[in-house]
Amino acid sequence: FAATFYDIETLKVIDEEWQRTQCSPRETCVEVASELGKSTNTFFKPPCVNVFRCGGCCNEESLICMNTSTSYISKQLFEISVPLTSVPELVPVKVANHTGCKCLPTAPRHPYSIIRR
Amino acid sequence: FAATFYDIETLKVIDEEWQRTQCSPRETCVEVASELGKSTNTFFKPPCVNVFRCGGCCNEESLICMNTSTSYISKQLFEISVPLTSVPELVPVKVANHTGCKCLPTAPRHPYSIIRR
């Protein structure tokens, strides 16, 4: 609607800003234990890992930025059980990494963001 | 705890992962209208903007990654009032941009993340 009133450069800047806010996989930091649903006597070092998760804006307020495809990345972490009965174990923890995102009307029944071992 | 049992390279990778998850300003996408607390008959195009906000992990579960310093970035956006009584106006919207973060025990009474006009 605004092409008549504003110079092309301003509109280009606004459009670039908008593109960068769009629903897409974004690097984010997740807490491993809470994602895994582990009890408080099992914890991880480091407690957080970096993965890609869907985020950003949709064109309509009624839509939610959701993952449509997921891969699982293996992160090497120390798993520590308290009381410490053995040496902290270096374990591969599979972390959900969102590879595709889409603006959807409702959240699917089974979101794919759970960490699997 | 693990220096004796695992090779230096593995530990280095784990440590680098941890450093990357630490509390710091991270590029994030915020919805302008909800941040501004605008009524539902005023909306913006684009509805979202990219700014830096504090995020990430702390060394203690009880600490929260909070902003300690903030700058305000001016973003050019179209402000649209519904019903459309006039031409959408190009307005400068000042958006809070976190420039410093710290893991704090409790959230300060007046967080500095509100968008100002």
Epitope: K45, P46, P47 | A3, N59, E60, E61, S62, K102, T106
Partner: antibody, heavy 118, light 112 residues
Framework: QVQLVQSGAKVKQPGASVKASCKAS????????MYWVRQAPGQGLEWMGY????????TYNQKFKGRVTMTTDTSTSTAYMELRSLRSDDTAVYYC???????????WGRGTLVTVAS | DIVMTQTPLSGPVTLGQPASISCRSS???????????LHWLQQRPGQPPRLLIY???NRFSGVPDRFSGSGAGTDFTLKISRVEAEDVGVYYC?????????FGRGTKLEIK
């Protein structure tokens, strides 16, 4: 295994400063906050503050603000606590303690006895 | 500051018998994240403190299972099911929900 080795006992005059050290080993130094706690003779424990060795950020007990400075040297995995304008009631054992992600002070140094006397 | 009130302040206990220490905080220790950061420490004579229990009820590494913690909100308890000679010392509750972190005044456990 995790070890926190603290500097030896010190005797100081009132008004002077003291700097206690705490050398950490057996874990990633930057991954855990380091607390400082003191204990006057025959008394209980008093929390002085902590430092995040990764960022260098500190949080101090208001009671000691302006008198205490906590620092770290990540190259040697050593934490330091300096207390200025010493008074006789600062005579105490000063402990460093590593804090786990879940908040408990899980490993302690053996303490540095600081005696303030003229 | 959060005041941690421990009872009793001292108590002679018979070997093999149970012992219980109470700790009450002046404000709730439930953090905004839903967790409760109440911990128990033991200090044997001439030793630095040692972590026994973290987050109300989790036993730390190497702590015998005769030690247990319970409670919620503002009221917490440390129980020793059967006191042994090595349990002699002072027991402290501490909280890390609020700043400043604070400790109870300590409970001295002695053998009868």
């Amino acid at each position: 295994q995790v070890q926190l080795v603290q500097s030896g006992a010190k005797v100081k005059q009132p008004g002077a400063s003291v700097k206690a050290s705490c050398k950490a080993s057996g874990y990633t130094f930057t991954g855990y906050n380091m607390y400082w706690v003191r204990q006057a003779p025959g008394q209980g424990l008093e929390w002085m503050g902590y430092i995040d060795p990764y960022s260098g950020d500190t949080t101090y007990n208001q009671k000691f603000k302006g008198r205490v400075t906590m620092t770290t040297d990540t190259s040697t995995s050593t934490a330091y606590m300096e207390l200025r304008s010493l008074r006789s009631d600062d005579t105490a054992v000063y402990y460093c303690a590593r804090t786990s992600y879940y908040g408990g002070m899980d490993y302690w140094g053996r303490g540095t006895l600081v005696t303030v006397a003229s | 500051d959060i005041v941690m009130t421990q009872t009793p302040l001292s108590g002679p206990v018979t070997l093999g018998q149970p012992a219980s220490i109470s700790c009450r905080s002046s404000q709730s220790l439930v953090h905004s994240n839903g967790n409760t950061y109440l911990h128990w420490l033991q200090q044997r004579p001439g030793q630095p403190p040692r972590l026994l229990i973290y987050k109300v009820s989790n036993r730390f590494s190497g702590v015998p299972d005769r030690f247990s913690g319970s409670g919620a909100g503002t009221d917490f308890t440390l129980k020793i099911s059967r006191v042994e000679a090595e349990d002699v010392g002072v027991y402290y509750c501490s909280q890390s929900t609020h700043v400043p972190r604070t400790f109870g005044r300590g409970t001295k456990l002695e053998i009868k």
